[in-house]
Amino acid sequence: EVEKTACPSGKKAREIDESLIFYKKWELEACVDAALLATQMDRVNAIPFTYEQLDVLKHKLDELYPQGYPESVIQHLGYLFLKMSPEDIRKWNVTSLETLKALLEVNKGHEMSPQVATLIDRFVKGRGQLDKDTLDTLTAFYPGYLCSLSPEELSSVPPSSIWAVRPQDLDTCDPRQLDVLYPKARLAFQNMNGSEYFVKIQSFLGGAPTEDLKALSQQNVSMDLATFMKLRTDAVLPLTVAEVQKLLGPHVEGLKAEERHRPVRDWILRQRQDDLDTLGLGLQGGIPNGYLVLDLSMQEALS
């Protein structure tokens, strides 16, 4: 093996080009200068190296930059990025959105890998918050990105960034995440008029409190059943039959099909049967006439 450490005569690479695909791994190691590789990283992307050869090229860069690659190299990693481990990426300082886009492009069409998750984490932490341009970029590549964040992480999203969020970006968010996002959305869209406001806020309503739902019921919004079913149960329960009727408008008929599912089921149990009957939908399970309803939570608060 000793003789293989020296580059054979005439094989020293003067530039990064297609001829290198014919080099054995030990020849790449011996004949490609790491500094040359770093300055011509953009060429690697256009050369069909084997994965084994890419391992050698990565090793050379690792030796040249033991503390982590500079951004000038990172931006041109191309598909060599797929060879990086999360540990490698944690050494990087990525500040340019263009660099982030270039690397996300390499992983496009695939699930978010641990490498990509680490890259995004490094980038966002470096910026201090999820600004609109970053959020735009991330949700374009990964529509489920927002819902992968913890409520704590979501708290760093400024209300101005909410404008970048599309309804599909929230599809997999749970109530705890929507609890954080809803107040930001309410703030972001506060200057819009009624119908426009509802179109924008609709996707976030899974985090809305009762008082906001009551306010919406006064605005003829005609909420669809899919949105209603995603509302917080605790926010829906205090709504009266009249308020729900106003909130849903013509979609109120859909309650019948959902009467066994939350939050409709739990809401029905809290309404007087007399009131439910006024809807003419045949909803059953309300409080029978003549029964007294004690609100125990109120009693506890008084004592």
């Epitope: 256009a46 598909y79 390499v106 496009k108």
Partner: nanobody, 113 residues
Framework: LQLVESGGGLVQPGGSLRLSCAAS????????IGWFRQAPGKEREGVSS????????NYADSVKGRFTVSRDNAKQTVYLQMNSLKPEDTAVYSC????????WGQGTLVTVS
């Protein structure tokens, strides 16, 4: 999105074969293509490469003068014409595309015996 190789088979020494590498689900036009081979127990090695335009081709010393690489972008296919085949050319041949993304084919077996 994949590359599919075909054209492999059993051939006698001195014979010829033409391998094809076709793109499925993406367009080959913007990609440089490399042909590689791997014999049992050996390191995978580069055989030839062709630029995205087809204007630049390269060959490993061991196949120069015997193999020719070409491409037909209209058919989204790259070819490897292999003449004067030798027993040491026996291997699984696969193609790879590079140019922003990377695609590898599953390979096609060439046996010279």
């Amino acid at each position: 999105l994949q590359l599919v190789e075909s054209g492999g088979g059993l051939v006698q020494p001195g014979g010829s074969l033409r391998l094809s590498c076709a793109a499925s689900g993406f367009t080959l036009d913007n990609y440089a293509i490399g042909w590689f081979r791997q014999a049992p127990g050996k390191e995978r090695e580069g055989v030839s490469s062709i630029s995205s335009s087809g204007g630049s081709t390269n060959y490993a010393d061991s196949v120069k003068g015997r193999f020719t690489v070409s491409r037909d972008n209209a058919k989204q296919t790259v070819y490897l014409q292999m003449n004067s085949l030798k027993p040491e050319d026996t291997a699984v041949y696969s193609c790879a595309a590079a140019g922003g993304f990377r695609y590898w084919g599953q390979g096609t077996l060439v046996t010279v015996s």
